[in-house]
């Protein structure tokens, strides 16, 4: 989907020497690291499914698209891609599925053109707050990143080291305000239970936000007001029960927005009335005719757009004196 692509038709393969061999000399312009395939014409290097345990040191200076997927990298240390001369052209870096569990502060420093980074499908138990900003200054130099893909980076539940995974990820996104230019952020399939309230306000350039396949129950404390450029908001496959008036008004106020809400367990009681009214009027929800009630039982599978106020009742709560045992 959002991984770096290549028009390479012919790749040169390297000689099969050890991938972790360190070259003290700057790489030759046409050199290709061991266990990788290189195309200078396409400015692309692919080191895919080769069980590499470190980032190759001898990457060619021309590389614009770097695939390091399906490896055994485990750790990205500070300056993992720092080279002399620097990899000044590197614009798209795909590290998905490489068994990374630790990304340290400054891991992506000295990549002045890096616009697209994919860390998906890595169990990131230890993501430094300064992984993307590179420094612990309150305001860092702006990152060139425009697209950050962090789908399915949650470690197994017993390996999360007793801290909020959401908080760890958000700290990395907000540190030093380095990601002010970020336009696409994908955080799908991460078991997020909540969205920390600061996160969106500090990413004002976002065009595309994917929070699908998480466990979000409510958006009550999340503000979309500042995201005036937002074009797509993916909230499919979460645990949303209802969207309240404040959220509805904010979404309606975004000029270019398309919202995706499929496969949430909507609760069709009296609290749903405002959302149903809004759905009938709005054009921002894609596939709104597919949204159905999950609860209460009597409303299961009813289409939200077909409901009227008489359908949306709440069982009265009896005062204790009137309750029977």
């Amino acid at each position: 989907s959002s991984s770096p692509t290549s028009s390479a038709s012919s790749f040169s393969s390297s000689a099969p020497f050890l991938a972790s061999a360190v070259s003290a000399q700057p790489p030759l312009p046409d050199q290709c690291p061991a266990l990788c395939e290189c195309s200078e014409a396409a400015r692309t290097v692919k080191c895919v499914n080769r069980n590499l345990t470190e980032v190759p040191t001898d990457l060619p200076a021309y590389v614009r698209n770097l695939f390091l997927t399906g490896n055994q990298l485990a750790v990205l240390p500070a300056g993992a891609f720092a080279r002399r001369p620097p990899l000044a052209e590197l614009a798209a870096l795909n590290l998905s599925g490489s068994r990374l569990d630790e990304v340290r502060a400054g891991a992506f420093e000295h990549l002045p053109s890096l616009r697209q980074l994919d860390l998906s499908h890595n169990p990131l138990a230890d993501l430094s707050p300064f992984a993307f900003s590179g420094s612990n200054a309150s305001v860092s130099a702006p990152s060139p990143l425009v697209e950050l893909i962090l789908n399915h980076i949650v470690p197994p539940e017993d390996e999360r080291q007793n801290r909020s995974f959401e908080g760890m990820v958000v700290a990395a996104l907000l540190a030093g305000r380095a990601l002010q230019g970020l336009r696409r952020l994908e955080l799908a399939s991460n078991h997020f239970l909540y969205l920390p309230r600061d996160v969106l306000a500090q990413l004002p350039s976002l065009r595309h936000l994917d929070l699908s396949n998480n466990s979000l129950v409510s958006l009550t404390y999340v503000s979309f007001r500042n995201l005036t450029h937002l074009e797509s908001l993916h909230l499919e496959d979460n645990a949303l029960k209802v969207l309240h008036n404040g959220t509805l008004a904010e979404l309606q106020g975004l000029p270019h927005i398309r919202v995706f809400l499929d496969n949430n367990p909507w609760v069709c009681d009296c609290h749903m009335a405002d959302m149903v009214t809004w759905l009938k009027e709005t054009e921002v929800v894609q596939g709104k005719d597919r949204l159905t009630c999950a609860y209460p039982e009597k409303m299961r599978n009813r289409v939200l757009l077909e409901l009227n106020s008489a359908d949306l009742d709440c069982d009265p709560i009896l005062p204790p004196s009137l309750q029977t045992s």
């Epitope: 069980n51 345990t53 055994q72 990298l73 485990a74 750790v75 490489s98 068994r99 990374l100 569990d101 630790e102 890595n122 169990p123 138990a125 230890d126 470690p155 197994p156 390996e159 080291q161």
Partner: nanobody
């Protein structure tokens, strides 16, 4: 400090198999990497294989690739080394180690077991 206890060593013929185990006294959260080293008589201790507790990334020294498999059982706090196609040159005391780094150097590891002897002879 985590206590590491190896078991499973023994005598085996060339081409045979053994499985070594290393039980940790507790989950070594502070040690992100578990490894096997070996030391043959009169030689330096050398890296064999390593695995990350989280994520399960693995790495091997060249001479054992395709013959040895390192794994871990997080629920049991146990590290394993499945060794097959054993050769005479695999004879050594095998040590389990725990450390922070994703490395192959002796100094990358802070906690060590006492070792278990593997002997490969006809």
């Amino acid at each position: 400090e985590v206590q590491l206890v190896e078991s499973g060593g023994g005598e085996v013929q060339p081409g045979g198999s053994l499985r070594l185990s290393c039980a940790a006294s507790r989950r070594p959260f502070s040690s992100k990497t578990m490894a096997w080293f070996r030391q043959a008589p009169g030689k330096e201790r050398e890296f064999v294989a390593a695995v990350r507790w989280i994520g399960g990334a693995t790495r091997y020294t060249e001479s054992v690739k395709g013959r040895f498999t390192i794994s871990r059982d997080n629920a049991k706090n146990t590290l394993y080394l499945q060794m097959s196609s054993l050769r005479a040159e695999d004879t050594a005391v095998y040590y389990c180690a725990a450390g922070q780094a994703w490395g192959t150097k002796f100094t990358d590891y802070s906690d060590w077991g006492q070792g278990t002897l593997v002997t490969v002879k006809p």
